[in-house]
Structure formats: structure tokens, C-alpha cells
């Protein structure tokens, strides 16, 4: 299994290094998750031809995956630290059900899928400490999530492969946009 951030050999070799700041810890955590996604995408792409499909073809899906928009304040035009932070946390909370779906979708990367899920939970905690306006963060309804999970798991094999690919790609894009914005904060 991948080693969580802060526990790699480089850290062991440098025991006198300054402890990471909150921002550095978040940055490292997101990069760790991106590494995990990269490994999962490799397995997915080796197993099916989804990765060759055009973005336009894949866009025709019923998944309501979180996505950054101009109004979220995470892009340079209209950048707003607090609005953006709320969007990042809300989006990550919405992704959790999809990360749960991924748990039984991998054979050789089962531990990696679990690591991505658990690391995302830790990331949410880091970000919640950073946010001032926690009241603005809406938590997904557990009942809705449960029925969504059941629906996704009932799909045929091809649709499940497509769903897996879309979740990984969307989650990667969301994390990249989030990290770019966080690096401005």
C-alpha cells in the first residue's frame, strides 16, 4: 500500500526538518491522493478502452459529479478565498459516495482505492480546520447517497467501467483545480 504523506523515506532521513505548515500539509495530502488516482487510472485504462473515449462521448452520462464553475470563486477571475474553500470542502464531501463506489472496482489496486478514500477523509478534516464559514458547507444526505450507491452498483459491466473512469477523471480535475486555488490562499 502507498505510504501516507509525512511517512516516506525522505522524511525519515531528515528528522530535523521544520514541521509542515497547515498549507504544506494540505498540498502534500492532495498530491498524495493524485498519485493514488494515477495508479487507479492505470489499472482502469489497462482493463478497458474507456481512456481512449473522447471527452464529448463521456460527457453523456447521468452522474452528477462535483465540478468547479466560475461562481465558485476558485478561478483567477472572481477568485474568492472563502467561497472557494466552501466549494472545495462541499465538493469533496459529495465525492465521498463515488469513492465508496470505487472500493470494489479494483483487483490489483484494492489497497490503493482504500488509501484514496481514507486520504480524502483526512483532507476534508484538514480543510475544515482552515475554513471559517463551516455553516455554509452542506453535507450530502446519507439516504440519497445510499440509493445512489445501490443504483451505480446495479449497472451493467460496461456502464460500471465507464462510471469508474468518469469518477477518477472528474476527481482528478477537481483536486487539481482545488490545489491550484489553495496555492493562491
Amino acid at each position: 500500500a502507498p505510504v501516507p504523506p509525512g511517512e516516506d523515506s525522505k522524511d525519515v532521513a531528515a528528522p530535523h526538518r521544520q514541521p509542515l505548515t497547515s498549507s504544506e500539509r494540505i498540498d502534500k495530502q492532495i498530491r498524495y491522493i493524485l498519485d493514488g488516482i494515477s495508479a487507479l487510472r492505470k489499472e482502469t485504462c489497462n482493463k478497458s478502452n474507456m481512456c481512449e473515449s473522447s471527452k464529448e462521448a463521456l460527457a453523456e452520462n447521468n452522474l452528477n459529479l462535483p465540478k468547479m464553475a466560475e461562481k465558485d470563486g476558485c478561478f483567477q477571475s472572481g477568485f474568492n478565498e472563502e467561497t472557494c474553500l466552501v466549494k472545495i470542502i462541499t465538493g469533496l464531501l459529495e465525492f465521498e459516495v463515488y469513492l465508496e463506489y470505487l472500493q470494489n472496482r479494483f483487483e490489483s489496486s484494492e489497497e490503493q482505492a482504500r488509501a484514496v478514500q481514507m486520504s480524502t477523509k483526512v483532507l476534508i478534516q484538514f480543510l475544515q480546520k482552515k475554513a471559517k464559514n463551516l455553516d455554509a458547507i452542506t453535507t450530502p444526505d446519507p439516504t440519497t447517497n445510499a440509493s445512489l450507491l445501490t443504483k451505480l452498483q446495479a449497472q451493467n459491466q460496461w456502464l460500471q467501467d465507464m462510471t469508474t473512469h468518469l469518477i477518477l477523471r472528474s476527481f482528478k480535475e477537481f483536486l487539481q483545480s482545488s490545489l491550484r486555488a489553495l496555492r493562491q490562499m
Epitope: R31, L34, K172, E173, Q176, S177, L179, R180, R183, Q184
Partner: nanobody, 123 residues
Framework: EVQLVESGGGLVQAGGSLRLSCTAS????????MAWFRQAPGKEREFVTD???????WYADSVKGRFTISRDNAKNTVYLQMNSLRPEDTAVYYC?????????????????WGQGTQVTVSS
């Protein structure tokens, strides 16, 4: 790690335009965030602009509205279109790549760098 080669620099008069190119080899270019930094004589290297894997762009305030970054993944190339050039834009311009596809306004976010191309703006 990706190798980067910049081109397109030169001498131009104030108010003029230049287009810099940076061509990458040795990696999956489309998955990298690409950036331009610059270093004027006697000054620190500073962020100019970047473009993420999914195409989002950021600009330094000093170049906003004058410079445009774009990428052509089929050609493994990132461009910097510089218009309304000023003498203070004179610098060596460096191309940089971030393998996480994110980018950012600090040098530490990038794992590959080009050798740089000189841009001189005369008044």
C-alpha cells in the same frame, strides 16, 4: 521527467509583440501543468503565467491583459503571446512543467525547467 526547450525570444520595440514557444519531450505532455517564469537582470525569477492540465490559466498582475498562455497538446508545445511589451518585460523567460498537472505561482511547484530564452524590449 520532461525536457523543455524554449524559443521565440529576441529584441523588440516597446509596444511590440512576441510569441514564445516551449516544446516538451520525454513525458505525457497533456498531463502536465505548464508555466512561464522570467528573470530580469539582478532580480529574482518571478512567475508570469501558468496553464493547468485541464486548461485553467492564471496570470501575474503585471502581465494580465497583455500576455496570453495557450497549449497545443498535439504538438507538445506551450505558447506565450506577449503584446504591448514594455521595457520592464525585459528578462530571460523560462518554461516550467509540473507533473501533477496543477501549477502555481512559486518555483517549488515545478519539477522540470527549460534553459530560458532572452527577451529584450527597447524604449
Amino acid at each position: 521527467e520532461v525536457q523543455l526547450v524554449e524559443s521565440g525570444g529576441g529584441l523588440v520595440q516597446a509596444g511590440g509583440s512576441l510569441r514564445l514557444s516551449c516544446t516538451a519531450s520525454g513525458g505525457t505532455f497533456s498531463e502536465y501543468a505548464m508555466a512561464w517564469f522570467r528573470q530580469a537582470p539582478g532580480k529574482e525569477r518571478e512567475f508570469v503565467t501558468d496553464i493547468g492540465e485541464s486548461g485553467g490559466t492564471w496570470y501575474a498582475d503585471s502581465v494580465k491583459g497583455r500576455f496570453t498562455i495557450s497549449r497545443d497538446n498535439a504538438k507538445n508545445t506551450v505558447y506565450l503571446q506577449m503584446n504591448s511589451l514594455r521595457p520592464e518585460d525585459t528578462a530571460v523567460y523560462y518554461c516550467a512543467a509540473d507533473s501533477y498537472g496543477v501549477g502555481g505561482g512559486a518555483e517549488r511547484y515545478y519539477d522540470s525547467w527549460g534553459q530560458g530564452t532572452q527577451v529584450t524590449v527597447s524604449s
